[in-house]
Interface confidence: low
């Protein structure tokens, strides 16, 4: 069937438009294109005659038309008037006629459009605005964006007028942004530069800045104020309600007591007519005293007296806070605090308590620190330690001792020989000494300020012969694989040589064995059960030696796991059950049974007569040493046989 | 009467030592708390070290710990600061001071008597 498709359908004004025939029949004489629905001699724009190749125009041909030999019809410049339809009047050889309408419309190209409103200055929560999208043209849709995006959905936003007015109702500051409309229609679609809505409002209640209220005399005061406004707010301020100045920021240098009252901002907005305030209240305090501490004692004993330090001056409605070490008070039963905290005692003063403490007083604003203080604690003096600790000298030489006391105020010294005073010196010299110089001698330790005396008597031995040494121990029960044993030979004495000997050897060479203290201690690292020996030490000098009793080291070990005997593991119906468990330890281990889990006797032997196939089953023996704190354990299966 | 008379002072570049001392006459030496201030030009006198008459405690600012050691010498009526680790920032006046029994300050109060200082220069 003959059909006529317009390429395009809307075509915009200007353009041309393609008429394409689609199933034009053949054996054709020609064809003749009309402007209308219909065949209408009036209205022929062209006709062709296919034999001549000739185009005849018509009564509506107006020059911009163009006939293919495929009977197909270009209308260039396409003006208004050309939109409708458009029917072909094709003949065929047999004279038979056929005929097909096409149609197109023709649109305008659309301008730029622009954005009117009813006003351009509305205020807040008060006006309406009305943009209206120009130029009003027939055929058009009008379509409304707000910062690049579509209408939101909101009640206060209105389209009307065919979409070609946007009204906003009682405008709000958030509606500042940015329009723009846009005109379509079939052929072209064109966007309005952006109107930026300008949406008066405020002042909004000022904020003053900072928020604090509180100020110390003789610091600065600026506050500063800002109230939400379009167009800029202006700024008054009121203090004790007398006009100030006016201005965003009130500065006041080096306020006093006198400064303290009612502050207040007032924000106008000279295009909205409207005023709001915001009112502050200022304080200004004193300035503090700075803190001190006194105390009841400056000369506290330890152990006996107490100390009440009070922190000054004594300020009603204050907070008294106290630090010790640059630290919090410590919970202690030592520590009391007054009601007011004001006064803090300390009960039984230790040399420990000196400190240093610091006070102090907390007020709104911040918290003023006393200076630090330290207690002058008298102690001791705690027992003398007399050095060297030699016991033993050899005729000839010179005895230096010294003595030293923990002490404050530092101890005053005296020696004594045999209860006999000597000197009042911290060290004591004895040249060339000899046998006669053998005796007790005392260093006694004065402290004057707390009365306190102590002594320590020490046995000078003088003797060309050294004396029969003896071994002592740090641990005279040691765990195998756990611990340590240091054997020492005394005494301790001047220039000597001190030996070591394990069962009569010399001592084998082993990392687990290492001498120290001049060779006078011997230390057994993670001793073994065959450590176990007897040791000697000897000691000997230029012109004499001398060894010790032996001293066999008593080593704790095992439980190891236990041996079950005899080895036996089936027995006949009838026999008696005999079984012996034995584990290595020192000391020996408690024996306890077990049979199929249930416990029977504390005995290392288990005895049971004419045994029967309801002896089948497990038999534990469990062993403990309670001095390691080790267990061990075996089971041994036994079968009885009909 | 009594005395503090400090010595040892001088110009050190940075990193180096020096030992003050401050003899002290006229006083029962082993009873008094003894301490180093400094004062450097257009600041406040500030305390240093300090240490207690037995020697068993000492006390630094915070500034000197680490780097300055504070130590006596009661047979000799002597207090010592060793400083080492100098910095252009210990550069100052120092004084020695004396504080009888009683609580310790930790600042210039509580001292009863002072030295006429030494100068301490730390420069390149």
């Known amino acids: 069937k003959l059909t006529i498709e317009s390429t395009p359908f809307n075509v915009a004004e200007g353009k041309e438009v393609l008429l394409l025939v689609h199933n034009l029949p053949q054996h054709l004489f020609g064809y003749s294109w009309y402007k209308g629905e219909r065949v209408d001699g009036n209205r022929q724009i062209i006709g062709y005659v296919i034999g001549t190749q000739q185009a005849t125009p018509g009564p509506a041909y107006s020059g911009r038309e163009i006939i293919y030999p495929n009977a197909s019809l270009l209308i260039q410049n396409i003006i208004q008037n050309d939109t409708g339809f458009y029917t072909l009047h094709v003949i065929k050889s047999d004279l038979v006629n056929e005929e097909a309408t096409g149609q197109f419309r023709v649109y305008p190209e659309l301008p730029k459009p622009s954005i009117s409103s009813n006003n351009s200055k509305p205020v807040e929560d008060k006006d309406a605005v009305a943009f209206t999208c120009e130029p009003e043209t027939q055929d058009a849709t009008y379509l409304w964006w707000v910062n690049n995006q579509s209408l939101p959905v909101s009640p206060r936003l209105q389209l009307s007028n065919g979409n070609r007015t946007l009204t906003l109702f009682n405008v709000t500051r958030n509606d500042t942004a940015s329009y723009k409309c846009e005109t379509q229609n079939p052929v072209s679609a064109r966007r309005s530069d952006s109107v930026i809505l300008n949406v008066l409002y405020g002042p909004d209640a000022p904020t003053i800045s900072p928020l604090n209220t509180s100020y110390r005399s003789g610091e600065n005061l600026n506050l500063s104020c800002h109230a939400a406004s379009n167009p800029p707010a202006q700024y008054s301020w009121f203090v004790n309600g007398t006009f100030q100045q006016s201005t965003q920021e009130l500065f006041i240098p080096n306020i006093t007591v006198n400064n303290s009252g009612s502050y207040t901002c007032q924000a106008h907005n000279s295009d909205t007519g409207l005023n709001r305030t915001t009112v502050t209240t200022i304080t200004v305090y004193a300035e503090p005293p700075k803190p001190f501490i006194t105390s009841n004692n400056s000369n506290p004993v330890e152990d006996e007296d107490a100390v009440a330090l009070t922190c000054e001056p004594e300020i009603q409605n204050t907070t008294y806070l106290w630090w010790v070490n640059n630290q919090s008070l410590p919970v202690s039963p030592r520590l009391q605090l007054s009601n007011d905290n004001r006064t803090l005692t300390l009960l039984s003063v230790t040399r420990n308590d000196v400190g240093p403490y610091e006070c102090g007083i907390q007020n709104e604003l911040s918290v003023d620190h006393s200076d630090p203080v330290i207690l002058n604690v008298l102690y001791g003096p705690d027992d003398p330690t007399i050095s060297p600790s030699y016991t033993y000298y050899r005729p000839g030489v010179n005895l230096s001792l010294s003595c030293h006391a923990a002490s404050n105020p530092p101890a005053q010294y005296s020696w004594l020989i045999d209860g006999n005073i000597q000197q009042h010196t911290q060290e004591l010299f004895i040249s060339n000494i000899t046998e006669k110089n053998s005796g007790l001698y005392t260093c006694q330790a004065n402290n004057s300020a707390s009365g306190h005396s102590r002594t320590t008597v020490k046995t000078i031995t003088v003797s060309a012969e050294l004396p029969k040494p003896s071994i002592s121990s740090n641990n005279s029960k040691p765990v195998e694989d756990k611990d340590a044993v240091a054997f020492t030979c005394e005494p301790e004495a001047q220039n000597t040589t001190y030996l070591w000997w394990v069962n009569g050897q010399s001592l084998p060479v082993s990392p687990r064995l290492q001498l120290s203290n001049g060779n006078r201690t011997l230390t057994l690292f993670n001793v073994t059960r065959n450590d176990a020996r007897a040791y000697v030490c000897g000691i000997q000098n230029s012109v004499s030696a001398n060894r010790s009793d032996p001293v066999t080291l008593d080593v704790l070990y095992g439980p190891d796991t236990p041996i079950i005997s005899p080895p036996d593991s089936s027995y006949l119906s009838g026999a008696n059950l005999n079984l012996s468990c034995h584990s290595a330890s020192n000391p020996s281990p408690q024996y306890s049974w077990r049979i199929n889990g249930i416990p029977q006797q504390h005995t290392q032997v288990l005895f049971i007569a004419k045994i029967t196939p309801n002896n089948n089953g497990t038999y534990a023996c469990f062993v403990s040493n309670l001095a390691t704190g080790r267990n061990n354990s075996i089971v041994k299966s036994i079968t009885v046989s009909a | 009467e009594v005395q503090l008379v400090e010595s040892g002072g001088g110009v050190v570049q940075p990193g180096g030592s020096l030992r003050l001392s401050c003899a002290a006459s006229g006083l029962t030496f082993s009873t008094y708390t003894m301490g180093w201030f400094r004062q450097a030009p257009g600041r406040e006198r500030e305390f240093v070290a300090a240490i207690i008459w037995s020697g068993s405690n000492t006390y630094y600012a915070d500034s000197v710990r680490g780097r300055f050691t504070i130590s006596r010498d009661n047979a000799r009526n002597t207090v010592y600061l060793q400083m080492n680790s100098l910095r252009p920032e210990d550069t100052a006046l120092y004084y020695c001071?004396?504080?009888?029994?009683?609580?310790?300050?930790?600042?210039?109060?509580?001292?009863?008597?002072w030295g006429q200082g030494t100068l301490v220069t730390v420069s390149s």
């Open positions: 001071a004396a504080q009888h029994f009683g609580p310790i300050g930790l600042t210039t109060r509580g001292y009863h008597y």
